[in-house]
């Protein structure tokens, strides 16, 4: 089970209208450049077999991957939203740095790995798709971690 006190974000992180709006605008803009509507990254397959109490840890993994492998490499695109949203998400990642789970997390890593593999397989269009799903990432973090 998670060390739940560390797998928590204050709800105030998700109640800032400006940065919430910028996050959703970034997702919307990227989704207009995403032509692959058949593939979904954040959805029931990601959460399958993961208990509610483990989902913040799961979303921490997805957030870190998205920052390191998607947003940082694409940081020159989708301005001005990107330059505001990336630091916001990086702060959330930092606040979740002590979120761990005790025991076996293989089922979680398996689900996250499938997401990573999908993004990598699609190449740049996978990265665009991940940016286009930042609204879902935001909502998933909020639902799982507050």
């Amino acid at each position: 089970a998670p060390i739940s006190s560390h797998c928590r974000l204050d709800k105030s992180n998700f109640q800032q209208p400006y940065i919430t709006n910028r996050t959703f605008m970034l997702a919307k803009e990227a989704s207009l450049a995403d032509n692959n509507t058949d593939v979904r990254l954040i959805g029931e397959k990601l959460f399958h077999g993961v208990s509610m109490s483990e989902r913040c840890y799961l979303m921490k993994q997805v957030l870190n991957f998205t920052l390191e492998e998607v947003l940082f490499p694409q940081s020159d695109r989708f301005q001005p939203y990107m330059q505001e949203v990336v630091p916001f998400l990086a702060r959330l990642s930092n606040r979740l740095s002590t979120c761990h789970i005790e025991g076996d997390d293989l089922h979680i890593q398996r689900n996250v790995q499938k997401l990573k593999d999908t993004v990598k397989k699609l190449g740049e269009s996978g990265e665009i798709k991940a940016i286009g799903e930042l609204d879902l990432l935001f909502m998933s973090l909020r639902n799982a971690c507050i």
């Epitope: 919307k28 207009l32 959805g43 509610m52 609204d135 909502m139 639902n143």
Partner: antibody, heavy 119, light 108 residues
Framework: EVQLVQSGAEVKKPGASVKVSCQAS????????IHWVRQTPGQGFEWMGW????????RYAQKFQGWVTMTRDMSNTTAYMELPRLRDDDTAVYYC????????????WGQGTLVTVSS | QSVLTQPPSVSVAPGKTATITCGGN??????VHWYQQRPGQAPVLVIY???DRPSGIPERFSGSRSGNTATLTISRVEAGDEADFYC???????????FGGGTKLTVL
């Protein structure tokens, strides 16, 4: 079999309150959000909010914020929706439904509870 | 504010194919779900994520999407398919699900 079973029909006077229950079975109750959605002939479907059975956390539609209360009892795997200060236009069929992520399709619905508000 | 538009009614002869559309402004990156509601009953999920079918739903039910229009297709229509059909998306900007107004399918 996965199912959500709701309490029976209610007739209430304006100004009264109603509490509808939704008992879950056949799956791990804590792993799915329970949403409440009402349906009226004029307005169609109207989402009211959800409760996270694992934490008791809630998220309400703006219209129902400060009005509706959604709770759950883990011991009997039941979610509740309480609506005080009923008005005539709250007459509707109230459904509970589950979803996995908080923003996914409602894959299982309760059978519905008709709440009639009439003086 | 995103609004989902469905035709109020669709009529089809048994054995033929029924198509029900759902139009929405800017749901390019939204996932569209479809529910069937028979008279006096609760809705049943028949298609999710645009085109996926839950277990137990006949293969005759399929979904697709092109641009801002999603389509539910029911092939080899049977009398028992007569019901109201609703499309739904989760609107992240208002953080709530939006439902179409419903389409009444009549089997002639």
């Amino acid at each position: 079999e996965v199912q959500l079973v709701q309490s029976g029909a209610e007739v209430k006077k304006p100004g009264a309150s109603v509490k509808v229950s939704c008992q879950a079975s056949g799956y791990t109750f804590s792993d799915y959000y329970i949403h409440w959605v009402r349906q009226t002939p004029g307005q169609g479907f109207e989402w009211m909010g959800w409760v996270n059975p694992d934490t008791g956390g809630t998220r309400y539609a703006q219209k129902f914020q400060g009005w509706v209360t959604m709770t759950r009892d883990m011991s009997n795997t039941t979610a509740y929706m309480e609506l005080p200060r009923l008005r005539d236009d709250d007459t509707a069929v109230y459904y509970c439904a589950r979803d996995l992520t908080g923003f996914d399709p409602f894959d299982i619905w309760g059978q519905g509870t008709l709440v009639t508000v009439s003086s | 504010q995103s609004v989902l538009t469905q035709p109020p009614s669709v009529s089809v002869a048994p054995g033929k194919t029924a198509t029900i559309t759902c139009g929405g402004n800017n749901f390019r990156n939204k996932r569209v779900h479809w529910y069937q509601q028979r008279p006096g009953q609760a809705p049943v999920l028949v298609i999710y994520y645009d085109s996926d079918r839950p277990s137990g739903i006949p293969e005759r039910f399929s979904g697709s999407r092109s641009g801002n229009t999603a389509t539910l297709t029911i092939s080899r229509v049977e009398a028992g398919d007569e019901a109201d059909f609703y499309c739904q998306v989760w609107d992240s900007s208002t953080d709530r699900p939006l439902f179409g107004g419903g389409t009444k399918l009549t089997v002639l």
